[in-house]
Interface confidence: medium
Amino acid sequence: KVFGRCELAAAMKRHGLDNYRGYSLGNWVCAAKFESNFNTQATNRNTDGSTDYGILQINSRWWCNDGRTPGSRNLCNIPCSALLSSDITASVNCAKKIVSDGNGMNAWVAWRNRCKGTDVQAWIRGCRL
């Protein structure tokens, strides 16, 4: 599923991401935009043999199990395919674990490069939340 901007903002808010670990909702929507272009079925392969999955491009080396990433830790204890569902619950729950890990949203390269320090509130402007 490819979410609309406000549709995703509303879904993320419903799942408790607004101000989770101090990160406003706009940060999460911005991250999703530049990680997956709001596409729940996005997959991208990395040079280390791992793959990033879903709307927040969660990595199989650390967070989920795709059955083929050497040394996978599967810290979210889920199959990576669960992160590709049109229901974003699994992605949100795993993202909460990631953002609590110590590096905050710096764990997402796209957030670091494209969202951090910008007017992230623009990503939820005009949305009925």
Epitope: G49, D66, G67, R68, T69, S81
Partner: antibody
Framework: QVQLQESGAEVMKPGASVKISCKAT????????IEWVKQRPGHGLEWIGE????????YYNEKFKGKATFTADTSSNTAYMQLSSLTSEDSAVYYC?????????WGQGTTLTVSS | DIELTQSPATLSVTPGDSVSLSCRAS??????LHWYQQKPHESPRLLIK???QRQSGIPSRFSGSGSGTDFTLSINSVETEDFGMYFC?????????FGGGTKLEIK
């Protein structure tokens, strides 16, 4: 136990298309990548590409882009590979395998012969 | 693409001999190298994964070693059922690639 059952041998004319199937049993089909591999005598094994059935995400070896197309039907736990514009170079045994990085589980292979 | 070169192309041995098969990668692939055995008209069978981990059900006479670019499959005291083709495969990057194979034949 995990099993991959491929469709039977095919004899096709040059220029035609063929669709090979791979039915998976014994595991959660949507969760694992399915890989496709070509084997020709004297050419060893070649990786064609892969599909994640749960999402339909696909990746192709550049060499096979435009030649192979992958699809999957999660309701029947079956993956498909269509090969188009067949030539004699496509005559080979085609395997599906479960994509665990290494390939512990293979289909029995589908022999494709392209001949006029 | 990562190229895998296997040597020798053919190995003629007598049952009871011990042999080593080589697989060399064109660039470092860490330990992401797997070995398969294939008999005529059969699918490949996984023997060794991640350079040195024996797949369950594979006899202990098969062992693997190496890291980076140079890998070895060793068969300690070859048995008649071991004859066939042996392939290496890398999973370090895409596209996945295979070696050209080593044929193990009876002398």
């Amino acid at each position: 136990q995990v099993q991959l059952q491929e469709s039977g041998a095919e004899v096709m004319k040059p220029g035609a298309s063929v669709k090979i199937s791979c039915k998976a049993t014994g595991y959660t089909f949507s969760t694992y990548w399915i890989e496709w591999v070509k084997q020709r005598p004297g050419h060893g094994l070649e990786w064609i590409g892969e599909i994640l059935p749960g999402s339909g995400s696909t990746y192709y070896n550049e060499k096979f882009k435009g030649k192979a197309t992958f699809t999957a039907d999660t309701s029947s736990n079956t993956a498909y590979m269509q090969l188009s514009s067949l030539t004699s170079e496509d005559s080979a045994v085609y395997y599906c395998a479960r994509g665990d990085g290494n390939y512990c589980y293979w289909g029995q292979g589908t022999t494709l012969t392209v001949s006029s | 693409d990562i190229e895998l070169t296997q040597s020798p192309a053919t190995l003629s041995v007598t049952p009871g001999d011990s042999v080593s098969l080589s697989c060399r990668a064109s660039q470092s692939i860490s330990n992401n190298l797997h070995w398969y055995q294939q008999k005529p008209h059969e699918s490949p069978r996984l023997l060794i994964k991640y350079a040195s981990q024996r797949q369950s059900g594979i006899p202990s006479r098969f062992s693997g070693s190496g890291s980076g670019t140079d890998f070895t499959l060793s068969i300690n005291s070859v048995e008649t059922e071991d004859f066939g083709m042996y392939f290496c495969q890398q999973s370090n990057s895409w596209p996945r690639t295979f070696g050209g194979g080593t044929k193990l034949e009876i002398k």
